[in-house]
Amino acid sequence: AFGISGVQKYTRALHDSSITGISPITEYLASLSTYNDQSITFALEDESYEIYVEDLKKDEKKDKVLLSYYESQHPSNESGDGVDGKMLMVTLSPTKDFWLHANNKEHSVELHKCEKPLPDQAFFVLHNMHSNCVSFECKTDPGVFIGVKDNHLALIKVDSSENLCTENILFKLSET
């Protein structure tokens, strides 16, 4: 991990950063949980998906999310976050044709059905943080991360180096 000035340098060019190719370089099917081991779940309600952050019962099955990894032409200055020196971006899809989107106006994270090529709002810069955690920074709004607020996912502005490692923007990925 690195300080906020590093984040700002790292993300300054994000608005102009284009994805290298329209195809992901690899994908990974994983369950997504918070730093405090709450599960991110997805529920179909009234023909749209809602996203929840909740404690699951002991034997309750975790929802899976497909992480699609893309190379950006913007160089990475973090060790372990890029491939061949290029920054990694991800899209997150819990079911076919639906992707997490950053709604910067509402500071919310939403699920939208859409076709490829995906809009910029569906792309997040992947940061590998401490303790095998990751964080997701909006491509469309550098310095803004997916985080947890009131048992929902929300967009959280990170404006100091202490906040960069705050628990509410850290997530764990696991196969189980």
Epitope: T26, Y28, K96
Partner: antibody, heavy 128, light 108 residues
């Protein structure tokens, strides 16, 4: 820059088990977002995918070889391995290990792979 | 499984010429998950193109890929001496992944 190197016996007797190891250098298997796999090429012929593995140990095999193949990973040694049982002369080939991108098909609920970094290959002959 | 047919089997061209290699799939796939590899004698294959049109790291821009559905093309705009080799296409839309039989590009 990630590099891969295959090792193992070059000669295996029919009905025995072929065992190969791939050592990864220049990067950690555990921290990689990629998968790892084995491909083979019989003399003068085309390429055949054998199987792939993620660092967690989750495996994906070619159905035509599945009953005879085991792929395993040892993250502490930064290695992954291939075992092919009950070999015949038809298993004579150059065996390559490779790093792989894995892509998911929602309809089939299955992963498939392309290989972006390859080892140099090792020739395995099945003969008595 | 998806069968990939490459044509022509052999392409005889001179350095500086344009090479057009074809790969046809037995079934259509919507993802454009098709890769191209180059293999020289005694060497491992090298990834050139993934996702039908995305160049792999370090691949010169004289190599380009195109196509969708069942028909895909690898184009080498101006052949360099080091480009004479065998080229394989490979689909990774569906498991098991499959390779084409290869096209040999030889010096005329």
């Amino acid at each position: 820059q990630v590099q891969l190197q295959e090792s193992g016996p070059g000669l295996v007797k029919p009905s025995e088990t072929l065992s190969l190891t791939c050592t990864v250098s220049g990067g950690s298997i555990r921290s990689s977002i990629f998968y790892w796999g084995w491909i083979r090429q019989p003399p003068g012929k085309g390429l055949e995918w054998i199987g792939s593995i993620y660092y967690s140990g989750r495996t994906y095999y070619n159905p035509s070889l599945k009953s005879r193949v085991t792929i395993s990973v040892d993250t502490s040694k930064n290695q992954f391995s291939l075992m092919l049982t009950s070999v015949t002369a038809a298993d004579t080939a150059v065996y390559y290990c490779a790093r792989a991108g894995g892509l998911y098909n929602w309809n089939d609920e299955s992963f498939s792979f392309y290989m972006d970094v390859w080892g140099n290959g090792t020739t395995v002959t099945v003969s008595s | 499984e998806i069968v990939l047919t490459q044509s022509p089997g052999t392409l005889s061209l001179s350095p500086g010429e344009r090479a057009t290699l074809s790969c046809r799939a037995s079934q259509s796939f919507s993802s454009s998950y098709l890769a191209w590899y180059q293999q020289k004698p005694g060497q491992a294959p090298r990834l050139l193109i993934y996702g039908a049109s995305s160049r792999a790291t370090g691949i010169p821009d004289r190599f380009s890929g195109s196509g969708s559905g069942t028909d895909f093309t690898l184009t080498i705009s101006r052949l360099e001496p080091e480009d004479f080799a065998v080229y394989y296409c490979q689909q990774y839309d569906r498991s098991p992944l499959t390779f084409g039989g290869g096209t040999k590009v030889e010096i005329k």
